[in-house]
Interface confidence: low
């Protein structure tokens, strides 16, 4: 997260860290007791490493009573996701067992109504991604409030030049932005999960390259079919 600040500890009980061989790789969001939603491209970076999900964390390194690392029973990338595009960049991870829910671990309701979020709406994005262009990684969860950007502006030739589909949404990126390591994390508007940070290698913090998020409402049928 660029231009953000340390989050209030455990105030986002849905927040997950997708880890490979014990290292944070991507963000994720707990959407059901045994399921974490993330970005499909995160798995490509995992190679053959052991994928696990950390729940109930604020600090990645410090012992915290609510923290627990779960093994992944199965990973379900969206069937249409491909390495060369950010289309359908969603991944569902089934935990080896149901998460122990509590004040610091709780699923987040996700948007099922397939309607664009009003441009200008302030949404919260959180993650353990880099906090500087130099690549400094935070130990504690960071967050930032970002205004939603209308798709037409986001698709301008000077911005993303038509790459933003109806199944994606954008947020402003003027110094405040999601960045490397935040992929798969939640974009929350009004207490509801609206978007998932895409995992492209986009430049961060440049206002002409807005943040791109996969709209979960557009994938309600797929999410329901996997969770069923």
């Amino acid at each position: 997260i660029l231009g953000g600040r340390e989050a209030e500890a455990h105030a986002r009980p849905y927040m997950a860290s997708v880890q490979v061989n014990g290292e944070h790789l991507c963000g994720g969001v707990l959407v059901a007791e045994q399921w974490v939603l993330s970005a499909a491209h995160c798995l490509e970076d995992a190679a053959d490493g052991k994928v696990q999900v950390l729940l109930g964390a604020h600090s990645l390194s410090q012992p915290e009573p609510s923290k627990r690392l779960y093994d992944v029973l199965r990973a379900v990338p969206h069937p249409d996701s491909r390495p060369d595009t950010i289309d359908h960049d969603l991944l569902l991870l089934q935990l080896s067992e149901k998460a122990t829910l509590g004040p610091a671990v709780r699923p987040l309701p996700w948007q099922r109504v397939d309607r664009d979020v009003e441009p200008g709406t302030l949404c919260d994005v959180a993650g353990w991604g880099i906090v500087s262009h130099a690549g400094r990684r935070p130990d504690r969860l960071q967050h930032v409030l970002l205004p939603v950007l209308d798709r037409a502006t986001c698709n301008r030739r000077t911005h993303h030049d038509g790459a933003i589909t109806q199944r994606m949404m954008c947020a402003e990126s003027n110094r405040r932005d999601s960045c490397k390591g935040d992929s798969g994390g939640p974009l929350v508007c009004g207490g509801v999960l609206e978007g998932v940070v895409t995992s492209g290698s986009r430049v961060c913090g440049n206002r002409k390259k807005p943040g791109i998020y996969t709209r979960v409402a557009s994938y309600a049928a797929w999410i329901d079919s996997v969770l069923a």
């Epitope: 009573p65 609510s66 509590g102």
Partner: antibody
Framework: EVQLQQSGPVLVKPGASVTMSCKAS????????MNWVKQSHGKSLDWIGV????????SYKQKFKDKATLTVDKSSSTAYMELNGLTSEDSAVYFC????????????WGQGTTLTVSS | EIVLTQSPALMTASPGEKVTITCSVS???????LHWYQQKSGTSPKPWIF???NLASGVPVRFSGSGSGTSYSLTISNMEAEDAATYYC?????????FGTGTKLEIK
């Protein structure tokens, strides 16, 4: 009104073990962490560890790892701390303290349990 | 672990006097994670100032807190008899949580 009611003073012999209790009321017990803090006579405060009453997960200060065991009974909203292998160094007042998760400071303290270790 | 050193260890102040207690932290912490507690003899500590500068409920406005990084302070603008107590700073930045060495404040 939030209250943390601790068990009464105890006098034990060296080498013995003791369990003290802390009964919480006035709030939802599982929604806040419970910490334990030691205060030797005339000394500063020393954090022992913390327990998440919801999950039973604990974290201890290194020097108390083999000395203290924290547990809870959710049904009675009570936290417990067992201290083993007692020596005169363990003579102190022990406080149970609410804090963490929804409050990142120690907002409510029990009245303290005085432990005296003497032969 | 993070070490908190308070100074002075003991001080005496006259009624109406301005009092400042300092807390030096061994490594930089977020100001939201530095707290102060007041303890009177034979009683439990009470939360006094949290997040460096926020007064806990019922704390008189003559108290204030400030600081950042590794240096924090608690100030009483005009000392009153009821302020005589021991004050402890404490960090919530990382486990293990640690307290300052304490400052005993007495009234002249």
């Amino acid at each position: 009104e939030v209250q943390l009611q601790q068990s009464g003073p105890v006098l034990v012999k060296p080498g013995a073990s003791v369990t003290m209790s802390c009964k919480a009321s006035g709030y939802t017990f599982t929604e806040y962490y419970m910490n334990w803090v030691k205060q030797s006579h005339g000394k500063s405060l020393d954090w022992i560890g913390v327990i998440n009453p919801y999950s039973g997960g604990t974290s201890y200060k290194q020097k108390f790892k083999d000395k203290a065991t924290l547990t809870v009974d959710k049904s009675s909203s009570t936290a417990y701390m067992e201290l083993n292998g007692l020596t005169s160094e363990d003579s102190a007042v022990y406080f149970c303290v609410r804090g963490g998760l929804r409050r990142n400071y120690f907002d409510y303290w029990g009245q303290g349990t005085t432990l005296t270790v003497s032969s | 672990e993070i070490v908190l050193t308070q100074s002075p260890a003991l001080m005496t102040a006259s009624p109406g006097e301005k009092v400042t207690i300092t807390c030096s932290v061994s490594s930089s912490i977020s100001s939201t994670n530095l707290h102060w507690y007041q303890q009177k003899s034979g009683t439990s500590p009470k939360p006094w100032i949290f997040g460096t500068s926020n007064l806990a409920s019922g704390v008189p406005v003559r108290f204030s807190g400030s600081g950042s990084g590794t240096s924090y302070s608690l100030t009483i603008s005009n000392m009153e008899a009821e302020d005589a107590a021991t004050y402890y700073c404490q960090q919530w930045n990382s486990y293990p949580f640690t307290f300052g060495t304490g400052t005993k404040l007495e009234i002249k």
